[in-house]
């Protein structure tokens, strides 16, 4: 039975040209995290594997930095980066947990962070 929950940074906004940390946290389970996939729609950004380290998709290698932790730092933001991002936690023995973050990249200098929220 899957008892865990994914806590994410929720809806966030950032300025064009800036950077943002995409962060998820798995709680309420003792399951072992074996891999985390970071995806934007159907496009892979990166994979963090517990044994192997990080695989950064070549399309993003100049703009994506691993971490902190299992999170991902997205740099040199453009308006085209606006959209949904997903952290997919592969765990043993529970299975897969998915968290969602919505990022809005703003032209203006006013970029406020949204509240944290949970996805069961």
């Amino acid at each position: 039975m899957m008892t865990g929950t994914i806590e994410t940074t929720g809806n966030i906004s950032a300025e064009k040209g800036g950077s943002i940390i995409l962060q998820c946290h798995l709680s309420s389970t003792t399951a072992q995290v074996t891999q985390v996939n970071w995806e934007q729609q159907d496009q892979l950004l990166a994979i963090c594997n517990a044994d192997l380290g990080w695989h950064i998709s070549p399309s993003f290698k100049d703009r994506v930095a691993p971490g902190p932790g299992l999170g991902l730092t997205l740099q040199s933001l453009t308006v085209n980066d606006t959209g949904e991002y997903f952290c997919i936690y592969h765990t043993y023995p529970d299975g897969t947990y998915t968290g969602r973050i919505f990022l809005e990249v703003l032209e203006s200098s006013v970029a406020e962070h949204g509240a944290r929220f949970q996805i069961p």
Partner: antibody, heavy 127, light 107 residues
Framework: QVQLQESGPGLVKPSQTLSLTCTVS??????????WNWIRQHPGKGLEWIGY???????YYNPSLRSRVTISVDTSKNQFSLKLNSVTAADTAVYYC???????????????????WGQGTTVTVSS | EIVLTQSPDFQSVTPKEKVAITCRAS??????LHWYQQKPDQSPKPLIK???QSFSGVPSRFSGSGSGTDFTLTINSLEAEDAATYYC?????????FGGGTKVEIK
């Protein structure tokens, strides 16, 4: 010498689930530097990658099939499996399992070639 | 996803002739390009990895070259047993992809 062998029903009815297993012999599926793939080939056509699984359970699926695919691993049996649900005639194909190797270092890893392939199993979707 | 375009689709060649098959990637894949040979009713057999590294047991008449987006598989002095379909494959970026294949027929 590592060998891979696909097994499963050769005939599946439309809307049902296709289930195949790949048995690894001559080596351990739990090796850190390998990933385990499913590939299919429609009659007279090219190769289509379905997805992979790592021994510890991490997966990545082809986005074109993701909504219908599950790949799982059983390290105790040295096997990994494919489930493809809601099949149609368009899923009729030869299904292959294959071992891919991984290069790792400096905190990063990369996918290499697929060096060992099963002989393939034909799956027909028909009522 | 990275699209691999092979050309030609089909080639009819006389024995001892030289064959060149090209594979073009829709974006740079560095050297993460591999070649497979598939004969009728058989599974693909690895030929060359990382552009130019031959697998063990592969005859020396098979060679590979290229980098970035343009790659070539060359068969020097074709033999009858080389009749097959040849596929390129990239492992640079997920999803992994294959070229559409080049069928080589012996005249």
């Amino acid at each position: 010498q590592v060998q891979l062998q696909e097994s499963g029903p050769g005939l599946v009815k439309p809307s049902q689930t296709l289930s195949l297993t790949c048995t690894v012999s001559g080596g351990s599926i739990s090796s850190v530097y390998f990933y385990w793939n499913w590939i299919r080939q429609h009659p007279g056509k090219g190769l289509e990658w379905i997805g992979y699984i790592y021994y510890s359970g991490g997966t990545y699926y082809n986005p074109s099939l993701r909504s219908r695919v599950t790949i799982s691993v059983d390290t105790s049996k040295n096997q990994f499996s494919l489930k493809l649900n809601s099949v149609t005639a368009a899923d009729t194909a030869v299904y292959y399992c294959a071992r891919g190797s991984i290069a790792a270092g400096g905190g990063y890893f990369y996918y290499n070639d697929m060096d060992v392939w099963g002989q393939g199993t034909t799956v027909t979707v028909s009522s | 996803e990275i699209v691999l375009t092979q050309s030609p689709d089909f080639q009819s060649v006389t024995p001892k002739e030289k064959v060149a098959i090209t594979c073009r990637a829709s974006q740079s894949i560095g050297s993460s390009l591999h070649w497979y040979q598939q004969k009728p009713d058989q599974s693909p057999k690895p030929l060359i990895k990382y552009v130019s590294q031959s697998f063990s047991g592969v005859p020396s008449r098979f060679s590979g070259s290229g980098s970035g987006t343009d790659f070539t598989l060359t068969i020097n002095s074709l033999e009858a047993e080389d009749a097959a379909t040849y596929y390129c494959h990239q492992s640079s970026s997920l999803p992994l992809t294959f070229g559409g294949g080049t069928k080589v027929e012996i005249k």
